[in-house]
Interface confidence: medium
Amino acid sequence: HTAAQDNCTCPTNKMTVCSPDGPGGRCQCRALGSGMAVDCSTLTSKCLLLKARMSAPKNARTLVRPSEHALVDNDGLYDPDCDPEGRFKARQCNQTSVCWCVNSVGVRRTDKGDLSLRCDELVRTHHILIDLRHRPTAGAFNHSDLDAELRRLFRERYRLHPKFVAAVHYEQPTIQIELRQNTSQKAAGDVDIGDAAYYFERDIKGESLFQGRGGLDLRVRGEPLQVERTLIYYLDEIPPKFSMKRLTA
């Protein structure tokens, strides 16, 4: 017999199929779309989440000025190729053999090409700027309270080490969260800033990836923080390579 684990679900990823077929009847969960086993004690990689999403049924300025090399995910959803560790493969291609290179968060960083396109390495996104606009409130939030609450959120909900939350800027109604994580800083077991940012983005949109947990209820000193617009900028360790045509468009 087996001591099959009851309540066999994946707390950190609702887009999974779970069954007690792990060692000794332990709960084992596989991501939809890829069928890859996932570690339910931490965040699932963005690549596997995007793949699962595509397989599911369709449903005196203090603010940072994004660098000229900052990328915004304008291409939207696609069905990505993930490596055996669940990371994005450096080169992504669609069904019509159009290919492009992506960074570690899966955002395109080159012009689109054909199957001859070479992407030598998966370039790491080491700096993410999350730009939020909150709905009008009676008064501005206290900056230090806001900072503490957002750091707590990333630590407790997304399990991102506080050292990777580089800064929280606030100029009502705009909030900017800076996440920084160099390759050398990321130890085994550390949540990737790209994965944390993706979970946060989905939470903000009311599309929580967590199993059975309520949606994100962000409060600062009891006052609800309701976000009405989100923009995320991605900065890579090596600047992207786009033709001048795109840059002037």
Epitope: T9, P11, G24, G25, R26, S41, T42
Partner: antibody, heavy 122, light 111 residues
Framework: QVQLVQSGAEVKKPGASVKVSCKAS????????MHWVRQAPGQGLEWIGY????????GYNQRFKSRATMTVDKSTSTAYMELRSLRSDDTAVYYC???????????????WGQGTMVTVSS | DIVMTQSPLSLPVTPGEPASISCRSS???????????LHWYLQKPGQSPQLLIY???NRFSGVPDRFSGSGSGTDFTLKISRVEAEDVGVYYC????????FGGGTKVEIK
């Protein structure tokens, strides 16, 4: 550093219940399975069951399924094991043990509590 | 349940000499995912068990390199290359591929 500190020794009468606690520190409590293992005097180790604190999922040895209940209090990082309808042959040292359950887990019990002696005697 | 059989039951050793403990399981311990979840523990007198070797041959952190594990399928061995006085106690093999079970233990004592 990882520490599992268990509650003190208990003396119980046959038919009674005992609830042993195990307070964890030095790691993220919800990330690891907690197992319960017992050892009768001069005997070997016998597995009772485990609980995954993140969502309360449990797995029991069939021998104990009807009498043992494992719970956790996430706010205090404490695991509990209650054993009901005690008999004299339940006299043993009861251990909690953390099991590696992260990415590419070993499923080995890597840290153990100091043990709680439970004596069942009329 | 999987039955884990250890031998010998008792092992008198001389400090500086090697020692070997055998563990046999009633079924293969290779899981469907290819891993073998066979572990070794030492319980020193008056103490809780402590992990020595996990997944057949991996030394747990802080475990001296005189301890090594080997084996596959149903037959496993723990070796101590040069026994030291602090190595006395009861050694248990354990599997977590199926419902966790422990071997009966091997008592290592100094001659």
């Amino acid at each position: 550093q990882v520490q599992l500190v268990q509650s003190g020794a208990e003396v119980k009468k046959p038919g009674a219940s005992v609830k042993v606690s195990c307070k964890a520190s030095g790691y993220t409590f919800t990330d690891y399975n907690m197992h319960w293992v017992r050892q009768a005097p001069g005997q070997g180790l016998e597995w009772i069951g485990y609980i995954y604190p993140y969502n309360g999922g449990t797995g029991y040895n069939q021998r104990f399924k009807s009498r043992a209940t494992m719970t956790v209090d996430k706010s205090t990082s404490t695991a509990y094991m209650e054993l009901r309808s005690l008999r004299s042959d339940d006299t043993a040292v009861y251990y909690c043990a953390r099991e590696d359950y992260g990415s590419s887990p070993s499923y080995a019990m890597d840290y153990w509590g100091q043990g709680t002696m439970v004596t069942v005697s009329s | 349940d999987i039955v884990m059989t250890q031998s010998p039951l008792s092992l008198p050793v001389t400090p500086g000499e090697p020692a070997s403990i055998s563990c046999r399981s009633s079924q293969s311990l290779v899981h469907g995912n290819g891993n073998t979840y066979l572990h070794w523990y030492l319980q020193k007198p008056g103490q809780s068990p402590q992990l020595l070797i996990y997944k057949v041959s991996n030394r747990f952190s802080g475990v001296p390199d005189r301890f090594s594990g080997s084996g596959s399928g149903t037959d496993f061995t723990l070796k101590i290359s040069r026994v030291e006085a602090e190595d006395v106690g009861v050694y248990y093999c354990s599997q977590t591929t199926h419902v966790p079970t422990f071997g009966g233990g091997t008592k290592v004592e100094i001659k």
